[in-house]
Structure formats: structure tokens, C-alpha cells
């Protein structure tokens, strides 16, 4: 794992040149996290966002923590246990399972830093892995060998 | 737009307590990004990882940049234009499309920091949005109203 030069700001330190220099790119909500205007039910729509047109449809659940970066995460929640028939868009097909796709997302929390002899020296960012469900996928069930 | 309390390290500054304190959690590749032992073809397997059992199967392509955090990103690439039949696991069903699910991921680039009078003062992290394809999803085609 690579480490980059970094530091732990303590009170009184000049923070005018930011280590995390925010670019001017606008940050829209994630495309998949845009809420769905369609009713949340076990059916595959013929319009709307990807998560409502999928034959393994899902909704997004907000997970907010003002003391975490990013503050807002969205977890996929499957609306059907099986896949929806491509033919009807509503009846379930028991030959396919709707399964969550997971991702270990890197998040940051602010924690006190400790200097020499355990003294408190400002705050550090602690990196963590946080499991997020991204989507529901229509899969063939596992055949146990 | 999110902002962190932060600072820009200059040479000679004690960096032993890292602002970006990498946790000791081992960081395996994302579960979905584990390379697929199954041949990459347009078929839905009955075992293996989610991306090979999906009826919209996909492979992962590595995108590595040593001056970016995270350094390794994986992009999903659909193996079929349509969904695979749940019945056979191999024949395509033209009633369903295999579509990429995108996500604007926050990444950080390492850039030189500039202090007063344009002097070089260590490195800063610049936040950017980076479009990543997460998975392929079997969807009903859009019906234009």
C-alpha cells in the first residue's frame, strides 16, 4: 500500500493551502442514487432509471453520517427475491435470483491524533472500509457441486 | 460540496501521524473485482462470482494510477449486448438489454502544493469525480412515450 506525504493539523497551524484541495467539479447525486419516481414494487418498468427498469429492481436507502466522508451513502435494497420475467415485467421467474452486489467503499472518519508520549495533536483522518450494496443483479442460482 | 479541515505538508514537517491514517484492515480487491476464473464469454454460469452468474455477465478491467487515491479502480465491461436466457444460461434473449450501471466516484489526485509567492510546498490532494462502471444489469428496453 502506498503512502503519500500527509500531516495532522493542530490548532494554530496554517491550513490555507489545503491538503485536500477541492476541485470545482460539481458533485451531483450519484446517477444510481437518484430517487425513482415510479412506485417501489416488484416489477420492471419500461421507462425511468436503471434501477426501476432492471428485472432485479431495487430502491436506494439513505445512510447519512455528518461525521463521515462521504456523508451520504446509498444502499441498494432488492424489491424482489427472484427476477422479474422479461416477457411480462411483473411476474417473477423462480429460475433466477435477485442478489445484492456489494462493494467495500473507502470512507474517512475524523479521529484525535496522538503525538509523542501520547499527547493529543489535532485531528487525523482514519480510513475505513465500509460495505455498501450497489445494485441488485439477476443471477442463475448456484448449483452446488 | 464537502470540505475537510486539512493542511498542506511542507518539507521537514513531521508526518509520523498521518492525516490519512491508513487503517490496518487488509484491503483486498473489491469482491466483484476478483478476477473471474471462468472463461469470459456471453453465458451465465451456475457457480463462481456474481459477475459470472449474472444473466448480464461482465468482466472487470483494471484502471491503475499511482498518483490517484484509490490507485486501483475496476471498470465493469458487459460480455453480452442482451441478457442471457435464465433457462439455458447461454442463448441471448433480445427482450432484455445488458446495460452498464455507472457511478461518479470521488477520487483524489496528488498534485504539487504552491505556497506563498508560488513556491512549491509538498503535495496536496485534489478531489475529483471519476466515472466508474460498477456492473451490468439486465433491463427491459425503454419504451419511448
Amino acid at each position: 500500500y502506498s503512502h503519500w506525504p500527509s500531516c495532522c493539523p493542530s490548532k494554530g497551524q496554517d491550513t490555507s493551502e489545503e491538503l485536500l484541495r477541492w476541485s470545482t467539479v460539481p458533485v451531483p447525486p450519484l446517477e444510481p442514487a437518484r430517487p425513482n419516481r415510479h412506485p417501489e414494487s416488484c416489477r420492471a418498468s419500461e421507462d425511468g432509471p436503471l434501477n426501476s427498469r432492471a428485472i432485479s429492481p431495487w430502491r436506494y436507502e439513505l445512510d447519512r453520517d455528518l461525521n463521515r466522508l462521504p456523508q451520504d451513502l446509498y444502499h441498494a435494497r432488492c424489491l424482489c427475491p427472484h427476477c422479474v420475467s422479461l416477457q411480462t415485467g411483473s411476474h417473477m421467474d423462480p429460475r433466477g435470483n435477485s442478489e445484492l452486489l456489494y462493494h467495500n467503499q473507502t470512507v474517512f472518519y475524523r479521529r484525535p491524533c496522538h503525538g509523542e508520549k501520547g499527547t493529543h495533536k489535532g485531528y487525523c483522518l482514519e480510513r475505513r472500509l465500509y460495505r455498501v450494496s450497489l445494485a441488485c443483479v439477476c443471477v442463475r442460482p448456484r448449483v452446488m457441486g | 460540496y464537502s470540505h475537510w479541515p486539512s493542511c498542506c505538508p511542507s518539507k521537514g514537517q513531521d508526518t509520523s501521524e498521518e492525516l490519512l491514517r491508513w487503517s490496518t484492515v487488509p484491503v483486498p480487491p473489491l469482491e466483484p473485482a476478483r478476477p473471474n476464473r471462468h472463461p469470459e464469454s456471453c453465458r451465465a454460469s451456475e457457480d463462481g462470482p456474481l459477475n459470472s452468474r449474472a444473466i448480464s455477465p461482465w468482466r472487470y478491467e483494471l484502471d491503475r494510477d499511482l498518483n490517484r487515491l484509490p490507485q486501483d479502480l475496476y471498470h465493469a465491461r458487459c460480455l453480452c449486448p442482451h441478457c442471457v436466457s435464465l433457462q439455458t444460461g447461454s442463448h441471448m434473449d433480445p427482450r432484455g438489454n445488458s446495460e452498464l450501471l455507472y457511478h461518479n466516484q470521488t477520487v483524489f489526485y496528488r498534485r504539487p502544493c504552491h505556497g506563498e509567492k508560488g513556491t512549491h510546498k509538498g503535495y496536496c490532494l485534489e478531489r475529483r469525480l471519476y466515472r466508474v462502471s460498477l456492473a451490468c444489469v439486465c433491463v427491459r428496453p425503454r419504451v419511448m412515450g
Partner: antibody
């Protein structure tokens, strides 16, 4: 009873900056966030952003993100909102409000408001 | 940004009347909707959070319902002190956005 007490009214010229304070009491400051909302005369409410009091992490509305800075001082349990390069359309009553740090982001206690007038 | 549309924009009702105010979101916001009451020259006051939970100290005549895009605030029996502007707010996606308000007057 939870209280948020804001600083007094300000009159500023276009291009100037204003810093509004919000003193919190009767609750554990670091367990919550502070959100800032403004209301122009005769208009509706506009969310400006928020800050986690423990972390200092902020989220700003895009409309003001280049001109706004929110900070907190845990030692005095005070939140601050600074708005720079003021324009006449920044004339409004500015409110601070307490917000939980989790998913249910409702504003359960509000300050009394600070009128900021921008006029040449 | 998510648009929040309230109706009616104003209403006049008598003491004891049942009053219903609606709020529609331009996109699904699950149950991430709050209702506030604001009186002239005062800060807003929280009435209902997460669509249907009554804030502590708020009279039981206030109730909220709905999820997805359509929400309702109901005052079961209007009281003289209930005049003011009622405002909905979505908190599902930043920027948080507010409705334009419904002005309630007592006949």
C-alpha cells in the same frame, strides 16, 4: 431546554463579508450537527449547508459553496457561518438549526435568526 | 435539485375544522420528509419528522402521512394558535429543499 442563540443584526456593503455566530447550550454539542438556512424577505427557506460539530466535515449548497465557510468551536460550543463577497440578494434572515448526525436529518431546534442586510 | 410543491398555497378555516395540506416531491424521497410551522417574525418549529413521527411537545392533533412523492399534513381540529405558514422539507438528497409554504388563516 436546548437553546441556540445567534449574534445580532448586521448591515454590510456589497463585496464585504459577514460572520454570524450561533451559541449552543443545554445539549452535548459534539453529538449533533449545525445546519444553516436563510430566508429572504417574503420568500421561502433556503438550505445553505451543514457541519458535523465533532468532525468539522461540511456540506455546502452549490449556490453559495465558493463563498461560504462553516466552522465550530467545541470549547465554546459555538458554530459560525461566514459568507464572503456579499451581494444584495444575500439580504435575508440567517438561521442556525440543530441537526442529528445520522440519516434522519430534521432540524429540531432553531436559533432566533440574524438579519443580514446588504446595501450600498 | 428536488422540487417540493405544496398545495394549497393558502387556506382559511374555522376553529374545529379538519385541515389537510399536501406536499409533492419531484422525485421519490422515501420517507425523508419533515413538516415545520412558522409564525411571522419567528424561526420555524419542527412538527413532524420522517413523514409521520410527531416531534416531542407537538399536540396530537397534528399528524403526517405519505411516502415516495406524496405527503400530507393533517390538523384534525384546528385551534386558534395554529395560524401560520406550514412548510415541508426533503432531506433525502442534498441540497435539502423546502416547499414554498401553505399559509393557514383562522376564519
Amino acid at each position: 431546554q436546548v437553546q441556540l442563540v445567534q449574534s445580532g443584526a448586521e448591515v454590510k456593503k456589497p463585496g464585504a463579508s459577514v460572520k454570524v455566530s450561533c451559541k449552543a447550550s443545554e445539549y452535548t454539542f459534539s453529538n449533533y450537527g449545525i445546519s444553516w438556512v436563510r430566508q429572504a424577505p417574503g420568500q421561502g427557506l433556503e438550505w445553505l449547508g451543514w457541519i458535523g460539530a465533532y468532525s468539522g466535515f461540511t456540506k455546502y449548497a452549490q449556490k453559495v459553496q465558493d463563498r461560504i465557510t462553516m466552522t465550530t468551536d467545541a470549547s465554546t460550543t459555538t458554530a459560525y457561518m461566514e459568507l464572503r463577497n456579499l451581494r444584495s440578494d444575500d439580504t435575508a434572515v440567517y438561521y442556525c438549526a440543530r441537526v442529528g448526525t445520522g440519516t434522519d436529518s430534521y432540524f429540531d431546534f432553531w436559533g432566533q435568526g440574524t438579519l443580514v442586510t446588504v446595501s450600498s | 435539485d428536488i422540487q417540493m410543491t405544496q398545495s394549497p398555497s393558502s387556506l382559511s378555516a374555522s376553529v374545529g375544522d379538519r385541515v389537510t395540506i399536501t406536499c409533492r416531491a419531484s422525485q421519490n424521497i422515501n420517507s425523508h420528509l419533515n413538516w415545520y410551522q412558522q409564525k411571522p417574525g419567528k424561526a420555524p418549529k419542527l412538527l413532524i419528522y420522517t413523514a409521520s413521527s410527531l416531534q416531542s411537545g407537538v399536540p396530537l392533533r397534528f399528524s403526517g402521512s405519505g411516502s415516495g412523492t406524496d405527503f400530507t399534513l393533517t390538523i384534525s381540529s384546528l385551534q386558534p394558535e395554529d395560524f401560520g405558514i406550514y412548510i415541508c422539507q426533503q432531506t433525502y438528497i442534498t441540497p435539502l429543499t423546502f416547499g414554498g409554504g401553505t399559509k393557514v388563516e383562522i376564519k
